[in-house]
């Protein structure tokens, strides 16, 4: 039985050229995390963090994606094309798979504030 919940940074905005932290947190379960996947809006894989073998950033994103903090992901040098949904997938045992969603809006405005708070989707 899956008792856990994924808390995410929810809907966030950041300015073009800046950076943003995508963060998910699995709570309310004792399940062991074997792997966390980060996917983009078109379901292309950005990175995985395997519990034993660590971080693997997909080569196409290596210059703009940094691992962490924690199981999160930092996107750098943001472009307007980065606007969209991002998904964290937690592979765990014995529970199975948990999935969280974040929506990132990249703003042209230099006054765009980075707004982030943890939400339960």
């Amino acid at each position: 039985m899956m008792t856990g919940t994924i808390e995410t940074t929810g809907n966030i905005s950041a300015k073009k050229g800046g950076s943003v932290i995508l963060q998910c947190h699995l709570s309310s379960t004792m399940a062991q995390v074997t792997q966390v996947n980060w996917e983009q809006h078109d379901h292309s894989l950005l990175a995985i963090r395997n519990a034993e073998l660590g971080w693997h950033i997909y080569p196409a994103f290596k210059d703009r994606v940094a691992p962490g903090p924690g199981l999160g992901l930092t996107l750098q040098s943001l472009t307007m094309n980065d606007t969209g949904e991002y998904f964290c997938t937690y592979h765990t045992y014995p529970d199975g798979t948990y999935r969280g969603r974040i929506f990132l809006e990249v703003l042209e405005s230099s006054v765009a504030e980075h707004s982030a708070r943890f939400q339960i989707p």
Partner: antibody, heavy 125, light 106 residues
């Protein structure tokens, strides 16, 4: 075709070290982890550990910690397993194996579909 | 570490028989369970991964089922080339194998 080719049989004295190589071909070496499994004569399979050919990170079986080192050379698509302070009970066939899933599949890793032919290591005085 | 107990350790069967091998984990491993076939002097061959997914190129007479702690490998109609030793392996860290089941000709 996808294959792993291992180095030849070795005979070692107790206390010595052995280094087994595993050359990969037919796929993108850095996209898959490589595991090592051994099998003593007439016995079952024993997990030794594995290595990410992408970032070099390793994870070893507890009982071999401190005696085993796994490395890769991405320029030659070769994985290596070195075992030190050999004992008679290290006599076994040593296999390298490639994970079924690439890092970029997004699937959980840990099943091995491509195996080397095995390297017999005999430890005897 | 999670212990994997296979049963039986050996069995005798005839061509055409339905053969069932079981594997029990000492704690729940969800569906992180793989099955291999090994013939003497050869490397293991992956048959089933993630408890029930048939590996490419493996005949459909092989099937896997189960989740949690109890898993089964079934050969629906044993063929001459199926006489071998079968191992389960759990892929929860740290990985471990079952002790093996030798399938012999009756």
């Amino acid at each position: 075709q996808v294959q792993l080719v291992q180095s030849g049989a070795e005979v070692k004295k107790p206390g010595a070290s052995v280094k087994v190589s595993c050359k990969a071909s037919g796929y993108t070496f850095t996209s898959y982890p490589i595991g090592w499994v051994r099998q003593a004569p007439g016995q079952g399979l024993e997990w030794m550990g594995w290595i990410s050919s992408y970032n070099g990170n390793t994870n070893y079986a507890q009982k071999l910690q401190g005696r085993v080192t796994m490395t890769t050379d991405t320029s030659t698509s070769t994985a290596y397993m070195e075992l030190r302070s050999l004992r008679s009970d290290d006599t076994a066939v040593y296999y390298c194996a490639r994970d079924l899933k690439s890092f970029w599949s997004g699937d959980v890793l840990g099943a091995f579909d491509i195996w080397g032919q095995g390297t017999m290591v005999t430890v005897s005085s | 570490d999670i212990q994997m107990t296979q049963s039986p350790s050996s069995l005798s069967a005839s061509v055409g028989d339905r053969v069932t091998i079981t594997c029990r984990a000492s704690q729940s491993i969800s569906s992180y369970l793989n099955w291999y076939q090994q013939k003497p002097g050869k490397a293991p061959k992956l048959l089933i991964y993630a408890a029930s997914s048939l590996q490419s190129g493996v005949p459909s007479r092989f099937s896997g089922s189960g989740s949690g702690t109890d898993f089964t490998l079934t050969i629906s109609s044993l063929q001459p080339e199926d006489f071998a030793t079968y191992y389960c392996q759990q892929s929860v860290p740290p990985r471990t194998f079952g002790g093996g089941t030798k399938v012999e000709i009756k």
